[in-house]
């Protein structure tokens, strides 16, 4: 017996499409085999039509296609403007055509409705408007104007001019009257729903005289678009729904079991909390376009999402939508990195960003995600030496470790960098990686002093205090700039006494800077790290004055000064928006990624108890 | 909220027919499956047939080995309800019949019964021999 399964029968009608699925055992062999649908003849043969190959038989260019979906086992043959003549028996199998690995379906089409003469059809898609338009004679000008629905053997009256409308319709139709000039009425249903469809009759006149024009509407609901990315990347839905509705609410929402539709964000403000810090509706262009990005894509993303318009901001009767069906591919080439990463206040975390390795020379961004209004995301550094004004001195991005991975670190931390952020390049806009800063309780185990203030001429001396815990780490000092952190020379002074219960593996590491000049003023920053992977880091700020008495300075914990107050928001960010960075791939195409993995190591960062996996950005 | 109510099994003699009933409501929206499952006594609940739908006239049909042939799934769209009709039926079809349905989605295989939201309370269906 064949392990594939399928539909048996599939019934449809001219014109109609249909999606036949079938389902295979998702062994890695029939993963990767060749998908076939085949016609079967008489004498027994079956025709290829499609494969997963590539083949399409002239049967079928341009109105079919085969998509294999291998973690789900199964695959989707699309067959589009079906006719009578693709009626018939068909397989649709894996491997080679003759060989049993197969599932028999018959397809059958039939006869669409038949239409009366001279029957005018309007083929419109759901939520949207038609215009019905009806021609009479001069004798019917003054004459009453209607339009029926034929509801089986008998006509019922929809509205007409008169005033009537019938209740179906309440709000959402109107009956004009062209000028003297032209013999004409119409009629304008808005908001067209599935129940719409049909059979219709206008009417000038009541009379045997009365003219008569037969109008047959289709409403189409859309055919969701099969969107298939991969777990921890992103997605994004453009949605394109027409100039009519430019003002009208979006939204996107997701369909849960029968007809509801929960709501992912729209743009009254609403934003389902799985979808927090992870999601943006880029603003709408003039003719009403907007688009969505999910960035962390997970398992329980996979789903039908529709997006469309209404007042309400949520799915009703009648709004225009647009539909897809995403897959979210578990054998995915985005590597897990850590979603929740920890540090205390004055402390410091060191984010690890996963990005494409064939695009190493792509520009790195980090942004902080704002829940405000549809959420955006402004920049706060790049890998171009652009480092927002707010942040100098405590962030930087390194192109360490490389080979697929970016270093960000934020020092000096405070309640108000919780919160989450986003790594992504201009290069491949899947790899898009989400983290959230938690602040927790704790004190920094890195110490320096506060504020430091160095004499033009004089040497400076500036302890750092490394506990016990980092006794195998690489100890560094280095400068920061803009573009990064200058490494610069140390010397070990031996056990640090700054920690109680810490033996002789704590460490006093000093930084020494010799005939002070002004170039020496600025960010200075002690840290550990292992190879090419940061750990923990503590920021210094050396000022540099005249002399005004000789001697060299050696600070020590106890003189040092208050940090400096925070600083203000500069008002010119840069945010993730089509105007905001130069490149347009940033949000021409936009996908993103994350996954679990909190960032381990005390007051650094700290794991959750039930996180089964820890990156350890100062452990590695 | 979509409730399912199965009718039309009762006892009957090998070989006869019976056609089973489900009637839903709630459904306003998207492409829709309603499948046919059957428990028998201390086993398992097994797949029998299934049938799903598009608004556009467009159904599809599925069934088990053991239904092949002999059960026909249908739909009335203007009544809400689908129909399983049984032919040349067995003692071994003997179970309680239960209809369950939920949105279409081409990654839900229609034979496994997790995937199903909604479930109808179960009629009994006796084949006598």
């Known amino acids: 017996k064949s392990p594939i399964f399928g539909p048996e029968e599939v019934n449809s009608v001219e014109g109609n499409s249909v999606s036949i699925t079938c389902y295979y055992p998702p062994t890695s062999v029939n993963r990767h085999t060749r998908k076939y649908w085949c016609r079967q003849g008489a004498r027994g043969g079956c025709i290829t039509l499609i494969s997963s190959e590539g083949y399409v038989s002239s049967k079928y260019a341009g109105r079919a296609n085969l998509t294999n979906f291998p973690e789900n086992g199964t695959f989707v043959v699309n067959i589009a403007q079906l006719s009578q003549d693709d009626s018939g028996r068909y397989k649709c199998g894996l491997g080679i055509n003759s060989r049993g690995l197969s599932f028999d379906v018959s397809l059958e089409v039939s006869q669409g409705p038949g239409l009366l003469n001279d029957t005018k059809v309007y083929t419109v898609d759901l939520g949207r408007t038609v215009t019905i338009n009806c021609p009479f004679k001069t004798e019917n000008a003054q004459k009453r104007k209607s339009l029926y629905k034929q509801i089986g053997l008998y006509p019922v009256l929809v509205i007409d001019s008169s005033g009537y409308v019938n209740p179906n319709y309440t709000g959402r139709i109107r009956l004009d009257i062209q000028g003297t000039g032209q013999l004409l009425f119409s009629v304008v249903i808005n908001q067209l729903r599935l129940s719409d469809a049909g059979q219709y009759l206008c009417q000038a006149g009541d009379d045997s005289n009365s003219n008569k024009k037969n109008a047959d509407l289709q409403v189409l609901k859309p055919e969701p678009e099969l969107v298939y990315e991969d777990l921890r990347g992103s997605v994004t839905f453009h949605c394109a729904l027409g100039p009519e509705v430019a003002n009208v609410a979006k939204f996107l929402c997701r369909q849960s079991s029968g007809e509801n539709c929960d709501v992912v964000v729209n743009t009254l403000g609403k934003r389902a909390p799985a979808f927090e810090g992870r999601i943006l509706l880029n603003p709408q262009d003039k003719d009403g376009s907007f688009s969505v990005v999910i960035t962390g894509l997970r398992k329980e993303d996979a789903g039908r999402y529709l997006c469309g318009a209404h007042s309400d901001g949520q799915l009703q009767e009648g709004s225009p939508i647009q539909a897809w069906q995403l897959f979210v591919n578990e054998e995915s080439t985005i590597p897990r990195s850590p979603t929740v990463v920890k540090g205390v206040a004055g402390g410091s975390v060191a984010v690890l960003c996963p990005y494409n390795r064939k695009e190493s020379k792509s520009i790195k961004y980090w942004c902080l995600w704002e829940g405000a209004q549809n959420g955006r995301c402004p920049l706060l550094v790049d890998s171009e030496g652009w480092v927002k004004a707010q942040y100098e001195g405590r962030l930087s991005l390194l192109e360490e470790p490389g080979n697929g991975t970016f270093t960000v670190i934020l020092n000096q931390l405070t309640s108000r960098d919780a919160g989450f952020y986003w790594c992504l390049t201009n290069g491949d806009t899947l790899w898009r990686t989400t983290v959230e800063i938690k602040i927790i309780e704790g004190e920094p185990n890195l110490k320096v002093p506060g504020n430091v203030t160095a004499v033009l001429g004089e040497t400076l001396k500036v302890p750092c205090h490394f506990p016990c815990k980092f006794s195998s780490y690489e100890k560094y000092w280095c400068k920061w700039n803009n573009t990064g952190c200058q490494a610069l020379p140390s010397q070990d002074e031996g056990p640090s006494k700054a920690f109680v219960n810490c033996d002789e593996n704590s460490r006093l590491v000093s930084l020494t800077l010799n005939l002070v000049t002004r170039a020496d003023e600025g960010w200075y920053w002690c840290g550990v790290k292992q190879g090419h992977f940061y750990g923990e880091t503590a920021a210094v700020y050396v000022a540099v004055e005249e002399r005004k008495a000789a001697g060299s300075r050696d600070v020590s914990l106890a003189k040092a000064d208050a940090a400096p107050d925070e600083k203000v928001l500069d008002s010119g960010f840069r945010e993730i928006e089509n105007k905001a960075i130069q490149d347009p791939r940033l949000f021409a195409e936009e996908k993103a990624v994350a996954d679990t993995r909190d960032q381990a190591d005390g007051s650094r960062a700290s794991v959750d108890s039930g996180s089964s996996e820890e990156q350890g950005g100062s452990s590695r | 909220e979509v409730q399912l109510v199965e009718s039309g099994g009762g006892l009957v003699q090998a070989g006869g027919s019976l056609r089973l009933s489900c009637e839903d409501s709630?459904?306003?929206?998207?492409?829709?499956?309603m499948g046919w499952f059957r428990q028998a006594p201390g086993k398992e609940r097994d797949f029998v047939a299934a049938i799903s739908w598009t608004g556009d006239s467009t159904y599809y049909k599925y069934y088990s080995d053991s239904a092949k042939g002999r059960f026909t799934a249908s739909r009335d769209n203007a009544k809400n309800t689908a129909y399983l009709q049984m032919n040349g039926l067995k003692p071994e079809d003997t179970a309680v019949y239960y209809c369950?349905?939920?949105?279409?989605?081409?990654?839900?295989?229609?034979?496994?019964?997790?995937?199903?939201?909604?479930w109808g309370q179960g009629i009994q269906v006796t084949v006598s021999s």
């Open positions: 369950a349905a939920r949105t279409f989605r081409i990654d839900y295989d229609p034979r496994t019964a997790s995937t199903y939201n909604y």
């Open positions: 709630g459904r306003t929206f998207g492409d829709y499956i």
